[in-house]
Interface confidence: medium
């Protein structure tokens, strides 16, 4: 807290300019009018104030706006945003995407801070849903943003917003998140033709059910092994050898290198060895010839 002292004669700041960098903290407190600061916030970012001086400027704004800053001030906070606490930000009502972009720009290239997380949370809650423009903006600044949301939060993403998602935005998503996003993506891209559809849906397939994988196998999509390895194990297990062969196309040869890893390992254990042999890849571990295959899940359902 800066002590209240009278401004020395001739030092009252008529405007926010670079001469203020030579003011001591107590002089800034005494000689800069808070209302003037609020109207000329856009100038602060261009002036090399130190952390300590920014503390004083923040203190002045806090006194002027105890209930939270208006958006006209927030939009021009610049580096002063780095001084805000999550508690400060919770008092704000940020509705403009331009304001959000301006503040994200200040933190660009750095990890998502608690301040940024709070700001995004306030903004999204204010809008009621993650619309396409917001998602576009957030994933541009933080490619991992989407995967930081809970499945519950993701459920508020409208299918139209999925068009803003790039493959790298889903890199850190877990199966529970993809389970929520996949049906939205399927809906969003439903009017595209086969090959274009596959290009768009590919990164979401970690949430696809068996029947959709079966359908894709009929479309000559040539899924790469990296995508196949991210599929849900429970969705892959019911696929036949012929369906996997069609799904992977020329990439089927890659199964040999992955035969000890899920979901390939578990899928092999469910296939007849005879059928696996037709691939000519030397895959081992299938059900030996002459053995009866019991579908235990079906048996349990009947009993």
């Amino acid at each position: 807290e800066v002590e209240k002292t009278a401004c020395p004669s001739g030092k009252k700041a008529p405007e926010i300019d670079e001469s203020l960098i030579f003011y001591k903290k107590w002089e800034l407190e005494a000689c800069v009018d808070a209302a003037l600061l609020a109207t000329q916030m856009d100038r602060v970012n261009a002036i090399p104030f130190t952390y300590e001086q920014l503390d004083v400027l923040k203190h002045k704004l806090d006194e002027l706006y105890p209930q939270g800053y208006p958006e006209s001030v927030i939009q021009h906070l610049g580096y002063l945003f780095l001084k805000m606490s999550p508690e400060d930000i919770r008092k704000w009502n940020v509705t403009s995407l331009e304001t959000l972009k301006a503040l994200l720009e200040v933190n660009k290239g750095h990890e998502m801070s608690p301040q940024v997380a709070t700001l995004i949370d306030r903004f999204v809650k204010g809008r009621g849903q993650l619309d396409k423009d917001t998602l576009d903006t957030l994933t541009a600044f933080y490619p991992g943003y989407l995967c930081s949301l809970s499945p519950e939060e993701l459920s508020s993403v409208p299918p139209s917003s999925i068009w803003a998602v790039r493959p790298q935005d889903l890199d850190t998503c877990d199966p529970r998140q993809l389970d929520v996003l996949y049906p939205k993506a399927r809906l969003a891209f439903q009017n595209m033709n086969g090959s274009e559809y596959f290009v768009k849906i590919q990164s979401f397939l970690g949430g696809a059910p068996t029947e959709d994988l079966k359908a894709l196998s009929q479309q000559n999509v040539s899924m790469d092994l990296a995508t196949f390895m991210k599929l849900r194990t429970d969705a892959v297990l019911p696929l036949t050898v012929a369906e996997v062969q069609k799904l992977l196309g020329p990439h089927v040869e890659g199964l040999k290198a992955e035969e000890r890893h899920r979901p390939v390992r578990d899928w092999i254990l469910r296939q007849r060895q005879d059928d696996l042999d037709t691939l000519g890849l030397g895959l081992q571990g299938g059900i030996p010839n002459g053995y009866l295959v019991l579908d235990l899940s079906m048996q349990e359902a009947l009993s």
Partner: nanobody, 117 residues
């Protein structure tokens, strides 16, 4: 983190000149505004001159017309040319970043400037 080493201070008679240098480590040096500060015995540290990443300069009223701040980004160095020195310029001189991204709490040893009358 940027580390700063100041040099070039010494004992000089009033009216004399000195050139201070501040060598900075860190690849991002060129993007930071920089400042020369001084602290006289029993007084608060004060900013004397500042230079932006692009080279624009500002000076405290007490040194305007006498001191010149400059920078060589290729050498990661900031200079302070001090002419027409006065006894009241006697102090330890420090340089530091003036970026809000860098908390100004990591100061170098400084370089002592003593101006005798």
């Amino acid at each position: 983190e940027v580390q700063l080493v100041e040099s070039g201070g010494g004992l000089v008679q009033a009216g004399g000149s000195l050139r201070l240098s501040c060598a900075a480590s860190g690849s991002t040096f060129s993007s930071y505004p920089m400042g020369w500060y001084r602290q006289a015995p029993g007084k608060q540290r004060e900013l004397v001159a500042a230079i932006s990443s692009g080279g624009s300069t500002n000076y405290a009223d007490s040194v305007k017309g006498r001191f010149t701040i400059s920078r060589d980004n290729a050498k990661n160095t900031v200079y302070l040319q001090m002419n027409s020195l006065k006894p009241e310029d006697t102090a330890v001189y420090y340089c530091n970043t003036r970026s809000p991204r860098v908390p100004n709490d990591s100061w170098g040893q400084g370089t002592q400037v003593t101006v005798s009358s």
